[in-house]
């Protein structure tokens, strides 16, 4: 089982116009639905239903972002427009360099993602749960600029900061 080491850097601007960066480390898993690769990009939070729209004009983001999707309890969406695998695929089609799923509310999605090994995506599809998911969503929900770096080995110490 491949651990995904995720560094999330939150950028907060001060009144003087400078950026203060806050780095948080968390771990997830590379699913068999995607590649075990490093990836980096600005975090874009996506609602599961937001991936349903098949409109090509929906490509609002440049290539190279990291999609973060908090999956809901399956009972809340009993007839989903896309499977979890389909949602990962749609995000990558729209330019995501990686997709991170919070599976805390829908842990069965772990098995769904690992059934994607017959035709895996060429980008990483990572899942997080528990305390790591809480940390990630706390940052994402601040709705400030944040970047994620996904690595398949522990990040070097001291933490390297992103070149903006």
């Amino acid at each position: 089982k491949e651990t995904a080491f995720v560094e999330v850097v939150l950028f907060e601007s001060s009144p003087s116009g400078d950026y203060t960066t806050y780095t948080t480390g968390l771990t997830g898993r590379f699913s068999r639905a995607g590649a075990t690769l490093s990836a980096e990009g600005e975090i874009v939070q996506m609602h599961p239903l937001g991936l349903c729209n098949n409109n090509d004009e929906e490509d609002l983001y440049e290539y190279g972002w990291v999609g973060v999707v908090k999956l809901e309890q399956p009972e809340l969406d009993p007839k989903p427009c896309l499977t979890v695998l389909g949602k990962a695929k749609r995000a990558v089609q729209r330019g995501a360099t990686a997709v991170i799923f919070d599976v805390s509310e829908n842990p069965e999605a772990i098995d769904q993602l690992n059934q994607g090994s017959e035709d895996p995506l060429k980008r990483p599809v990572v899942y997080v749960k528990g305390a790591d998911a809480i940390k990630l969503m706390n940052i994402v929900n601040k709705q400030k600029v944040a970047r994620a770096r996904i690595q398949h080995r522990p990040p070097r110490q001291p933490t390297e900061y992103f070149d903006m």
């Epitope: 089982k1 009972e75 098995d111 690992n114």
Partner: antibody
Amino acid sequence: QVQLKESGPGLVQPSQTLSLTCTVSGFSLTSYSVHWVRQHSGKSLEWMGRIWSDGDTSYNSAFTSRLSISRDTSKSQVFLKMNSLQTEDTGTYYCDRSGGSPFFDYWGQGVMVTVSS
Amino acid sequence: QFVLTQSNSVSTNLGSTVKLSCERSIGNIGSNYVNWYQQYEGRSPTTMIYKFDQRPDGVPDRFSGSIDRSSNSVLLTINNVQTEDEADYFCQSYSSDMYIFGGGTKLTVL
């Protein structure tokens, strides 16, 4: 086609350890969860625990302290180990599969285990 | 943690319609999927209904699942009951990484 088959001793001494093996075919352990469920002779079914497609495990809190589930993906086998057996652990033990939804789509044939001296 | 309660035994006539119930003790019955399994004497259980009302391939359409919110229960309805329907029926749900079974109902066909 999908198959699961349990194997192990039919008789175990009280206070000893139960070791069961579930050999699967027709699917990959790295894509599906395998669970252990037991059934007392009095009919009731009891979920014991599972090993997820990624190798993580979850256990029924009633068994946490004495149950261990592991696997060997190269042999397509899942193992159950439960220690400190008592007579009330007598029953039929099933391994079964789930695959992304919270229900069991395939069951093994079951193995009858009697705990007695 | 909730409990699923089923009647211990139910008898019905050949060709009739029977409803087997599975009541959830606490929490909304619709909050977590409920599934139904059939088990013949000395055999392994097989799935009859999953996700409240979905029927796997090979299960006769005489079998259907539904939710009865007034009693916080799920129902397994068997129409035109046949002798081969005589078996034990178990409901099952889940909650936070834990799978929960009802005690089972023995269906006797007269």
